[in-house]
Interface confidence: low
C-alpha cells in the first residue's frame, strides 16, 4: 500500500514534467530557483526556467536523449551555476559550484537566507495592478511566485501554487468589479497574512527535519495526525506519517518537483481511503487538487471513538512493558504517542511529545532496575506538572490579553522578551514579540479544550522564527541554548528565562528617539511598529525600568505623536516637542 513505490524512470525530468504538467512544472522550477538564488532579477530566473522547460520537453519526446538521465539536482545545479554574476552577487555561495552532487545541493541549501536583504514589497495602486494583470497575466502571476519564494526560501512549494491560484482568482474577480479596491484589498490582506503564517509553519517543519532529524519530525506527525484522525488505526497513521515525512523532507531539501508530485499522490491515497482515516474528509476530497491538499492539511479533528479503554493497562499495568519496549522501542513509543494523542485533542502537540519523552526516559531508567514495574508504576503521575504548566501559562496570558487588548499585550511581551534576551536585534525582538502577542486574538477566544493546541503550537512556530533569525547572526548564548537543546522544550525554556543580569545597558542615543512628520502618514500598524521599536530601545537602555515607568514614557510618547500630527507645522513640533520628550523620559527613567 506504499504510495511512493514507483518504477525506475529513465529520465527523472521527463517523468516529473509528465506527472505535473507544463504549468506546474514551470511554476515549481521558478520557485526552486528563486528560493536558491534570492537576489537574482526576475527576468534572469524566467530565462533559466524557460531553458529547463525546453530541455524537459526534449526528454519527454525521447528519454534517451543526451543528459536526460541526469538527476534533477545535477540539471538544476548546473543551470544555477551558469549565472554569470554568481560570485559578485552571492560571494562564497559561488564556491558551491565547485562541488559535486549531492554536496553541491547541500551547499546551496546552507546558503538559503531567512532574512534576505530585499526591499519591502510595496503594493501599487489597484488600477496599476489590474492593468498589469490584464496586460500579461502569466508574467504577473510568475512575478508573485518569484517575490514570495525569494523572501520565503522554505515556503511549502505546492502550497504556494495554491496561494497563486487564489491570487489569480482575486484579480480575475475584482478587476472587473465596480469598486475594485473594496473587492481586492481585503483579499490581498488575507492572502498576505495567511501566506506569512504558512511560511512560518513550514519553516518549523524544515527546522525540525534539518536540526533535529527525521525521528523528531515523525514524532510530531504521529501526534498531530493521531489527534486529527483518532478513529484511524495505528498502522494507518504510521503509513501516513511515513509518506508525509517523505513529502516534507523533499520540499525542505529543495526537491520541489518530487515533493509536489508525492503530495498529490498522498492526497489521492487519503481520499481513496477516507473510510479508514476520517469522517471529516468528504468535502476536501471533492475539491480540485491544490484545494484538496490544502483542505486535508487544515481539516478539523475527527470525533474520538467512544469508550476508548484506559491507557494504563497497556503502558503501565502490563508486566510486559519492558519486554515490549525492548522488542521495538520506536514502534512501542509510537503506539504510546498515538494512543495518548488520539485521546487528547485538548493538548498541544509539543506537550504530547514532552509526555512521550518523559515516558521514554522512565522506561530507559526503569527497565534496567531490579523491579521495573515498581519503578515505572507511577509514571503517569509525572505527567501532571507537565500538563499544568502550559495550562496555567495560557490562563494567565489570556487574562492579561483580555485586560490589555492586542497592542498593549504585545508591548508587555516586548518588555518581557527584551529583558530576557536584550542582545537580540531590535527588529527581530519587535517582529517576534508582535507575533507572540497575536496568540491572544488567535487563541484566547477558543474554549478551554482548544486553547492549548492553538496557543502552544502557534508559539512553537513563532519561537522558531526567533531561532532561525538568531542562527544567522548569533548574539545570545541563552537564545542558542533554548533553540538547540530540545525542539519540544523551546517554549518552556524561553518562559523560564529571567532578566539577563549580565547585560550591560546600551548607551543612550537621542537619535534613536528622534521622530519626524513622516510618522503621521504611516498606517496604524506601521505607527505601532515605530512605537514598539522605541519601547525595545528604552528597555535596552534601562533594563531595570519598572512597568509603571515604561508605561508613563510610552503614554507620553503616544500623546506627543498625536499632538504633533495635528499641528500645522508638524516638523517643527516633532523637533521641539521631541527634545522635551527625550529629556522628560531620561528624567523619568533616571538615564
Amino acid at each position: 500500500r506504499g504510495v511512493f513505490r514507483r518504477d525506475a524512470h529513465k529520465s527523472e525530468v521527463a517523468h516529473r514534467f509528465k506527472d505535473l504538467g507544463e504549468e506546474n512544472f514551470k511554476a515549481l522550477v521558478l520557485i526552486a530557483f528563486a528560493q536558491y538564488l534570492q537576489q537574482c532579477p526576475f527576468e534572469d530566473h524566467v530565462k533559466l526556467v524557460n531553458e529547463v522547460t525546453e530541455f524537459a520537453k526534449t526528454c519527454v519526446a525521447d528519454e534517451s536523449a543526451e543528459n536526460c538521465d541526469k538527476s534533477l539536482h545535477t540539471l538544476f545545479g548546473d543551470k544555477l551555476c551558469t549565472v554569470a554574476t554568481l560570485r559578485e552577487t552571492y560571494g562564497e555561495m559561488a564556491d558551491c559550484c565547485a562541488k559535486q552532487e549531492p554536496e553541491r545541493n547541500e551547499c546551496f541549501l546552507q546558503h538559503k537566507d531567512d532574512n534576505p536583504n530585499l526591499p519591502r514589497l510595496v503594493r501599487p495602486e489597484v488600477d496599476v495592478m489590474c492593468t498589469a494583470f490584464h496586460d500579461n497575466e502569466e508574467t504577473f502571476l510568475k512575478k508573485y511566485l518569484y517575490e514570495i519564494a525569494r523572501r520565503h526560501p522554505y515556503f511549502y512549494a505546492p502550497e504556494l501554487l495554491f496561494f497563486a491560484k487564489r491570487y489569480k482568482a482575486a484579480f480575475t474577480e475584482c478587476c472587473q468589479a465596480a469598486d475594485k479596491a473594496a473587492c481586492l484589498l481585503p483579499k490581498l490582506d488575507e492572502l498576505r497574512d495567511e501566506g506569512k503564517a504558512s511560511s512560518a509553519k513550514q519553516r518549523l517543519k524544515c527546522a525540525s527535519l534539518q536540526k533535529f532529524g527525521e525521528r523528531a519530525f515523525k514524532a510530531w506527525a504521529v501526534a498531530r495526525l493521531s489527534q486529527r484522525f483518532p478513529k484511524a488505526e495505528f498502522a494507518e497513521v504510521s503509513k501516513l506519517v511515513t509518506d508525509l515525512t517523505k513529502v516534507h523532507t523533499e520540499c525542505c531539501h529543495g526537491d520541489l518537483l518530487e515533493c509536489a508530485d508525492d503530495r498529490a499522490d498522498l492526497a489521492k491515497y487519503i481520499c481513496e481511503n477516507q473510510d479508514s482515516i476520517s469522517s471529516k474528509l468528504k468535502e476536501c476530497c471533492e475539491k480540485p487538487l491544490l484545494e484538496k491538499s490544502h483542505c486535508i492539511a487544515e481539516v478539523e479533528n475527527d470525533e474520538m471513538p467512544a469508550d476508548l479503554p484506559s491507557l494504563a493497562a497497556d503502558f503501565v499495568e502490563s508486566k510486559d512493558v519492558c519486554k515490549n519496549y525492548a522488542e521495538a522501542k520506536d514502534v512501542f513509543l509510537g503506539m504510546f504517542l498515538y494512543e495518548y494523542a488520539r485521546r487528547h485533542p485538548d493538548y498541544s502537540v509539543v506537550l504530547l511529545l514532552r509526555l512521550a519523552k518523559t515516558y521514554e526516559t522512565t522506561l530507559e531508567k526503569c527497565c534496567a532496575a531490579a523491579d521495573p514495574h515498581e519503578c515505572y508504576a507511577k509514571v503517569f503521575d509525572e505527567f501532571k506538572p507537565l500538563v499544568e504548566e502550559p495550562q496555567n501559562l495560557i490562563k494567565q496570558n489570556c487574562e492579561l490579553f483580555e485586560q490589555l487588548g492586542e497592542y498593549k499585550f504585545q508591548n508587555a511581551l516586548l518588555v518581557r522578551y527584551t529583558k530576557k534576551v536584550p542582545q537580540v536585534s531590535t527588529p527581530t525582538l519587535v517582529e517576534v514579540s508582535r507575533n507572540l502577542g497575536k496568540v491572544g486574538s488567535k487563541c484566547c477566544k477558543h474554549p478551554e479544550a482548544k486553547r492549548m493546541p492553538c496557543a502552544e503550537d502557534y508559539l512553537s512556530v513563532v519561537l522558531n522564527q526567533l531561532c532561525v533569525l538568531h542562527e544567522k547572526t548569533p548574539v545570545s548564548d541563552r537564545v542558542t541554548k533554548c533553540c538547540t537543546e530540545s525542539l519540544v522544550n523551546r517554549r518552556p525554556c524561553f518562559s523560564a528565562l529571567e532578566v539577563d543580569e549580565t547585560y550591560v545597558p546600551k548607551e543612550f542615543n537621542a537619535e534613536t528617539f528622534t521622530f519626524h512628520a513622516d510618522i503621521c502618514t504611516l498606517s496604524e500598524k506601521e505607527r505601532q511598529i515605530k512605537k514598539q521599536t522605541a519601547l525595545v530601545e528604552l528597555v535596552k537602555h534601562k533594563p531595570k525600568a519598572t512597568k509603571e515607568q515604561l508605561k508613563a514614557v510610552m503614554d507620553d510618547f503616544a500623546a506627543f505623536v498625536e499632538k504633533c500630527c495635528k499641528a500645522d507645522d508638524k516638523e517643527t513640533c516633532f523637533a521641539e516637542e521631541g527634545k522635551k520628550l527625550v529629556a522628560a523620559s531620561q528624567a523619568a527613567l533616571g538615564l
Epitope: 495505528f234 494507518e236 479508514s276 471513538p305 502490563s318 514502534v331 512501542f332 503506539m335
Partner: nanobody, 115 residues
C-alpha cells in the same frame, strides 16, 4: 511494518459457528488492546468486541453478547473471535484492529451466514 492478517471466515448456516484468527506482526502485540470490527455491505464499520493486552478484560457490543468470545495468544501474536449461534445479520467483512479503532487497516475476512 505493522501487519494484521485475518483468516477463518466463510459461508455458514444460521445457528452455526466459526472461529476467526488475526495474525499480528511488526509491533509489540502483548502491549496493546485489540478489537474486532465488522462492516456489512452498504453500512459503516461496527465495533464488535475488544480485549486488553493481557487478555483479562473483554468487552462486547450488545448485538453479539453471549454468542461471541474474544481471546488472544500473546506468544503466537494471534487474536481470536469465536462466533457461535450465528445469524444472517452477522454477515459482514470482519477486521481486527489495534486499540479500539473502528477503522479498517487490513483486508478482513468475509463471513456469510445463510438462512
Amino acid at each position: 511494518e505493522v501487519q494484521l492478517v485475518e483468516s477463518g471466515g466463510g459461508l455458514v448456516q444460521s445457528g452455526g459457528s466459526l472461529r476467526l484468527s488475526c495474525a499480528a506482526s511488526g509491533f509489540t502485540f502483548g502491549s496493546f488492546g485489540m478489537s474486532w470490527v465488522r462492516q456489512a455491505p452498504g453500512k459503516g464499520p461496527e465495533w464488535v468486541s475488544a480485549i486488553d493486552g493481557g487478555g483479562a478484560d473483554t468487552r462486547y457490543a450488545e448485538s453479539v453478547k453471549g454468542r461471541f468470545t474474544i481471546s488472544r495468544d500473546n506468544a503466537k501474536k494471534t487474536l481470536y473471535l469465536q462466533m457461535n449461534s450465528l445469524k444472517p445479520e452477522d454477515t459482514a467483512v470482519y477486521y481486527c484492529t489495534i486499540g479500539q479503532s473502528t477503522s479498517r487497516g487490513s483486508q478482513g475476512t468475509q463471513v456469510t451466514v445463510s438462512s
